[in-house]
């Protein structure tokens, strides 16, 4: 039975040209995290594997940095970066947990961080 929950940074906004940290946290389970995949809609951004470490997709290498922790840092943001991001936690023995973050990249300086929320 999967008992864990994913806590994410929820809906967030950031300024064009700036950077943002995408962060998820798995709690309420003793399952071992074997791998975390970060995806933007239907594109793989990065993978953090417990044995192999980080793999950043070549097309994102210039703008994506691993960490902090299992999170992901997006740099040199453009308006095209607006959209859904997913952290996919592969765990043993529970299976897969998925968290969702919505990022809005703004032209102006009115960007604010949204509240955290949980996805069971």
């Amino acid at each position: 039975m999967m008992t864990g929950t994913i806590e994410t940074t929820g809906n967030i906004s950031a300024e064009k040209g700036g950077s943002i940290i995408l962060q998820c946290h798995l709690s309420s389970t003793t399952a071992q995290v074997t791998q975390v995949n970060w995806e933007q809609q239907d594109q793989l951004l990065a993978i953090c594997n417990a044995d192999l470490g980080w793999h950043i997709s070549p097309s994102f290498k210039d703008r994506v940095a691993p960490g902090p922790g299992l999170g992901l840092t997006l740099q040199s943001l453009t308006v095209n970066d607006t959209g859904e991001y997913f952290c996919i936690y592969h765990t043993y023995p529970d299976g897969t947990y998925t968290g969702r973050i919505f990022l809005e990249v703004l032209e102006s300086s009115v960007a604010e961080h949204g509240a955290r929320f949980q996805i069971p």
């Epitope: 074997t34 791998q35 995806e39 239907d42 594109q43 793989l44 993978i47 594997n49 044995d51 192999l52 793999h55 997709s57 097309s59 592969h90 043993y92 023995p93």
Partner: antibody, heavy 118, light 107 residues
Framework: EVQLLESGGGLVQPGGSLRLSCAAS????????MHWVRQAPGKGLEWVAS????????GYADSVKGRFTISRDNSKNTLYLQMNSLRAEDTAVYYC???????????WGQGTLVTVSS | DIQMTQSPSSLSASVGDRVTITCRAS??????LNWYQQKPGKAPKLLIY???SLQSGVPSRFSGSGSGTDFTLTISSLQPEDFATYYC?????????FGGGTKVEIK
Amino acid sequence: EVQLLESGGGLVQPGGSLRLSCAASGFTFSSYSMHWVRQAPGKGLEWVASISSNAGTTGYADSVKGRFTISRDNSKNTLYLQMNSLRAEDTAVYYCARVPYDYWIDYWGQGTLVTVSS
Amino acid sequence: DIQMTQSPSSLSASVGDRVTITCRASQSISSYLNWYQQKPGKAPKLLIYAASSLQSGVPSRFSGSGSGTDFTLTISSLQPEDFATYYCQQSYSTPLTFGGGTKVEIK
């Protein structure tokens, strides 16, 4: 240099058993998931089985479930496939393969031929 | 199980031609799609992973695109050593499944 060397193939009668081995070298074997993939003569590729880096998780194609067992010995850098109750349709070249991030197969062995025939 | 359908099953082309092979998944697989090249009597070789990432050491004339259910492998200018069979493979879920293959032959 990454090397995967399969052995143990050969001719076996229907209902018989074989154990394939795959000796790995040139990388940290214990860090990678490993798979077996087969190819019947003149046919396409078919995934057979997978095993996680620490052997905690295994998976099998429906066509071999209950008959084949994948295992590994990280101290010997070796992957195994125990094949029981073999059938004519199991005739194929069997490849062992390295799978980083449980995602893509970046290295394949040269393959070993298993022929099931009376 | 996720079915992978490749087209065409075979094609004839000349050196220098632009070649496109398509692969369709029976359900969305995000970008969990890989492409392999196989020559007779040899093991397959990884060309493209995660739909569009070029494997190290693979010539830049190979490219991949697509997401969801529809994917494409393109060879921008076919070379003599590219005549082979090409397979797509999904790794979104087990059982992992391959397309039926596309044989690229000399015209």
